[in-house]
C-alpha cells in the first residue's frame, strides 16, 4: 500500500489536477448549458469538503453543440472523481453543521467554475499548512 507521504503527495497531485480540469472547462464556458448551479463561496472552516461535495454534485452539462462535446464530458466526469474514504470521513465529521448545497447562491457556469477553483486552491493551501504544522486533519 502507498506510504503516508506518497499518499499525501498523490492527494496533492489530484487536487491540483482538479484545478487544471476546471481551467480547461473555463475555455469552453460557451459550450456549457447556461444553467445556474449552487456555487459555494467564502466557505467556513471545516466545511470545505462539504462544499467540495456540492460542486461535484452540481449538474454541470455540455450544451452538446458538437465541436468540444467529448472533451467537456470527459472533463466533467473527471471533476466528479470521488476522493478516498479517509477524506469522506473528515467531511462526515462536520456535515451536520455545514450549509446544504441548496442554500448556496446559484451561479452560471463561468462563476461556478471560478468559485470551484477558488475552493480547491484554499483546500490545497490548507493541506500544505497542515503538513507544515504536523497536523493530520486536512
Amino acid at each position: 500500500h502507498k506510504s503516508s507521504s506518497q499518499g499525501q503527495d498523490r492527494h496533492m497531485i489530484r487536487m491540483r489536477q482538479l484545478i487544471d480540469i476546471v481551467d480547461q472547462l473555463k475555455n469552453y464556458v460557451n459550450d456549457l448549458v447556461p444553467e445556474f448551479l449552487p456555487a459555494p463561496e467564502d466557505v467556513e472552516t471545516n466545511c470545505e469538503w462539504s462544499a467540495f461535495s456540492c460542486f461535484q454534485k452540481a449538474q454541470l452539462k455540455s450544451a452538446n453543440t458538437g465541436n468540444n462535446e467529448r472533451i467537456i464530458n470527459v472533463s466533467i466526469k473527471k471533476l466528479k472523481r470521488k476522493p478516498p474514504s479517509t477524506n469522506a470521513g473528515r467531511r462526515q465529521k462536520h456535515r451536520l453543521t455545514c450549509p446544504s448545497c441548496d442554500s448556496y447562491e446559484k451561479k452560471p457556469p463561468k462563476e461556478f467554475l471560478e468559485r470551484f477553483k477558488s475552493l480547491l486552491q484554499k483546500m490545497i493551501h490548507q493541506h500544505l499548512s497542515s503538513r507544515t504544522h504536523g497536523s493530520e486533519d486536512s
Partner: antibody
Framework: QVQLVESGGGVVQPGRSLRLSCAAS????????MHWVRQAPGKGLEWVAF????????YYADSVKGRFTISRDNSKNTLYLQMNSLRAEDTAVYYC???????????????????WGQGTTVTVSS | EIVLTQSPGTLSLSPGERATLSCRAS???????LAWYQQKPGQAPRLLIY???SRATGIPDRFSGSGSGTDFTLTISRLEPEDFAVYYC???????FGQGTKVEIK
C-alpha cells in the same frame, strides 16, 4: 510486467465485420480507461475510441461513429473493438492503449496514453 | 474540434544537436491536457511527456516539454542516435493528435 496484446486483425472485404481483442496483464485493468488508436500505412496516429474504466461511457471518432463499438470485460481483463461495415479507409495498424489516469484517487495520474500494445493489422480489400 | 498543427514536418539534424519541435493548438489547451509521443518505425508509440512538461516514467532528461495556451514545444537537448523518430503531440480529452514531426539524420 505491464502488457497489452492485440489480436483479431486480418484481411477482410469491404462491408464485412471484424472484432479485435486486447488482452491486458500486469496491472489492475478495471481501474483504467482504455483506447483504440489506429495508423494507416505511411500516415499519422488517429484516435478511434475510448471506454471508461467501468464501461459507463464510450467515445468515438467521427470517422467510425455508428460502425465501431468499443467494449470491455473486466473479469477477463480484455478490451474489444467490434468493427462493422468496414471500408478501405479503415485499413491500418490498430493499437490498444491504456489511459494513464487511473480511477483510483491515489493511482496513476497521467493525462496521456502510457501503455501501448504492439498493434494488429487490419486490411480491408476486395 | 481542436486542431493541433506541428512544425516543421521534417527536421534534419545531426547527433548531438538540439531539436526543437512545435505544436500549435487552434484553441487554448490547459497544460495538463497536452502530451507528446515518440514513434520509431515498426514500433508502437511511447508516451514521452504529459502535462506539457512532465516526463513519463523512464524518459531521459534530455527530453523536455514547455508551453501553455496554444503554443507548446518539445525540446531534445542533445540528439542521440535512438532519438531519430516521429514525434506527435496530443490533446488529452479530445485525444486529437497532431500530424507529426519526423526527426531524421542529416
Amino acid at each position: 510486467q505491464v502488457q497489452l496484446v492485440e489480436s483479431g486483425g486480418g484481411v477482410v472485404q469491404p462491408g464485412r465485420s471484424l472484432r479485435l481483442s486486447c488482452a491486458a496483464s500486469g496491472f489492475t485493468f478495471s481501474s483504467y480507461g482504455m483506447h483504440w488508436v489506429r495508423q494507416a500505412p505511411g500516415k499519422g496516429l488517429e484516435w478511434v475510441a475510448f471506454i471508461w474504466y467501468d464501461g459507463s461511457d464510450k467515445y468515438y471518432a467521427d470517422s467510425v461513429k455508428g460502425r465501431f463499438t468499443i467494449s470491455r470485460d473486466n473479469s477477463k481483463n480484455t478490451l474489444y473493438l467490434q468493427m462493422n461495415s468496414l471500408r478501405a479507409e479503415d485499413t491500418a495498424v490498430y493499437y490498444c492503449a491504456r489511459d494513464g489516469d487511473s480511477s483510483d484517487w491515489y493511482g496513476d495520474y497521467y493525462f496521456g496514453m502510457d501503455v501501448w500494445g504492439q498493434g494488429t493489422t487490419v486490411t480491408v480489400s476486395s | 474540434e481542436i486542431v493541433l498543427t506541428q512544425s516543421p514536418g521534417t527536421l534534419s539534424l545531426s547527433p548531438g544537436e538540439r531539436a526543437t519541435l512545435s505544436c500549435r493548438a487552434s484553441q487554448s489547451v490547459s497544460s495538463s491536457y497536452l502530451a507528446w509521443y515518440q514513434q520509431k518505425p515498426g514500433q508502437a508509440p511511447r508516451l514521452l511527456i504529459y502535462g506539457a512538461s512532465s516526463r513519463a516514467t523512464g524518459i531521459p532528461d534530455r527530453f523536455s516539454g514547455s508551453g501553455s495556451g496554444t503554443d507548446f514545444t518539445l525540446t531534445i537537448s542533445r540528439l542521440e542516435p535512438e532519438d531519430f523518430a516521429v514525434y506527435y503531440c496530443q490533446q488529452y480529452g479530445s485525444w486529437t493528435f497532431g500530424q507529426g514531426t519526423k526527426v531524421e539524420i542529416k
